[in-house]
């Protein structure tokens, strides 16, 4: 049996930050699990890991330098990403592994979420402030 994962098809990261919710066909309550977010069509870059082990507190880390946090729901993990670059626009895949109790479970590969990172654009001030043109 495989866990099914649902993700938004696309998200826009304004202010270089985004929240990506991974929804699972499995209740993570009282389970030992490892939820992770991967970047790229080949999922080559592990962006963030959220590890749950029965306790109230989730352990969050990134081996690839991404600034992330997480939040656990009964059947979801939301990844919060900060300080994204425009060139980190890509497709991101949620992955879930349940280690305990047996049997070990993981997910069918999801369709992923395209995260479009919008750059910060500064609008130049008009030389002569006045009524704006339509």
């Amino acid at each position: 049996n495989k866990i099914l994962v649902k993700q938004s098809p696309m998200l826009v990261a304004y202010d270089n930050a985004v929240n990506l919710s991974c929804k699972y066909s499995y209740n993570l309550f009282s389970r030992e699990f490892r939820a992770s977010l991967h970047k790229g069509l080949d999922s080559a870059v592990e962006v963030c890991v959220v590890y749950g082990n029965y306790s109230q507190q989730l352990q969050v880390y990134s081996k690839t330098g991404f600034n992330c946090d997480g939040k656990l729901g009964n059947e979801s993990v939301t990844f919060y990403l900060q300080n994204l670059y425009v060139n980190q626009t890509d497709i991101y895949f949620c992955k879930i592994e349940v280690m305990y109790p047996p049997p070990y479970l993981d997910n069918e590969k999801s369709n992923g979420t395209i995260i479009h990172v919008k750059g910060k654009h500064l609008c130049p001030s008009p030389l002569f402030p006045g009524p704006s043109k339509p």
């Epitope: 507190q57 600034n67 992330c68 939040k71 300080n83």
Partner: antibody, heavy 120, light 107 residues
Framework: EVQLVESGGGLVQPGGSLRLSCAAS????????MHWVRQAPGKGLMWVSR????????SHADSVRGRFTISRDNAKNTLYLQLNGLRAEDTAVYYC?????????????WGQGALVTVSS | EIVLTQSPATLSLSPGERATLSCRAS??????LAWYQQKPGQAPRLLIY???KRATGIPARFSGTGSGTDFTLTISSLEPEDFAVYSC?????????FGQGTKVEIK
């Protein structure tokens, strides 16, 4: 006035344990991420651990993951760091620091520090 | 992780002189860089955040510039209380990292 006061430091043998506390006052403790940052003698600062505002998530530096545990009691306005499996290289002054829950890792107030010495 | 290199290690100056401290990152940290002041036996104090914004209560003689990989902290005219160790810190990438510090001492 924002105040962070660490306690619980001391001399411990290699392999031993210690629990540091940080009592917070002068601000809404439950609204801030809290951190531990350490400074070994004659060395620079090094980030150790963090916990988010409600205590639901935590992160640790690679060098302490699996040995140190950060926790908080928002009812008591207190931050904790449980140090297990201590090594000589963990000898340092340990500071607690607060960070806004939007910037995560920008430390705007620090405590005076607690000295942890690991030696046989 | 991102390595921050500060230079010089020590700066010997007299009160009233201008101090220029450098912090270089091993890769871009955008403008997510802070500067802290630390005196012996005291807690570090946030001076500058986001590369150029002065923290609350910090005198105007402290200023920060730079973005990407090269950053500078300038103290326009040193006061006796400014002799201390100054550290930079990035929060762009995880984990956050600090420079090794620059000591500003009285000449």
């Amino acid at each position: 006035e924002v105040q962070l006061v660490e306690s619980g430091g001391g001399l411990v043998q290699p392999g031993g344990s210690l629990r540091l506390s940080c009592a917070a006052s002068g601000f809404t403790f439950s609204s801030y991420w809290m951190h531990w940052v350490r400074q070994a003698p004659g060395k620079g600062l090094m980030w150790v651990s963090r916990i988010n505002s409600d205590g639901s998530t935590a992160s640790h530096a690679d060098s302490v993951r699996g040995r140190f545990t950060i926790s908080r009691d928002n009812a008591k306005n207190t931050l904790y760091l449980q140090l297990n499996g201590l090594r000589a290289e963990d000898t340092a002054v340990y500071y607690c620091a607060r960070a806004d829950s939007t910037t995560w890792y920008e430390f705007d107030f620090w405590g005076q520090g607690a000295l942890v010495t690991v030696s046989s | 992780e991102i390595v921050l290199t500060q230079s010089p290690a020590t700066l010997s100056l007299s009160p009233g002189e201008r101090a220029t401290l450098s912090c270089r990152a091993s890769q871009s940290v955008s403008s997510y860089l802070a500067w802290y002041q630390q005196k012996p036996g005291q807690a570090p104090r946030l001076l500058i955040y986001d590369a150029s914004k002065r923290a609350t209560g910090i005198p105007a003689r402290f200023s920060g510039t730079g973005s990407g990989t090269d950053f500078t902290l300038t103290i326009s005219s040193l006061e006796p209380e400014d002799f201390a160790v100054y550290s930079c810190q990035q929060r762009h990438n995880w984990p956050p990292t600090f420079g090794q510090g620059t000591k500003v001492e009285i000449k």
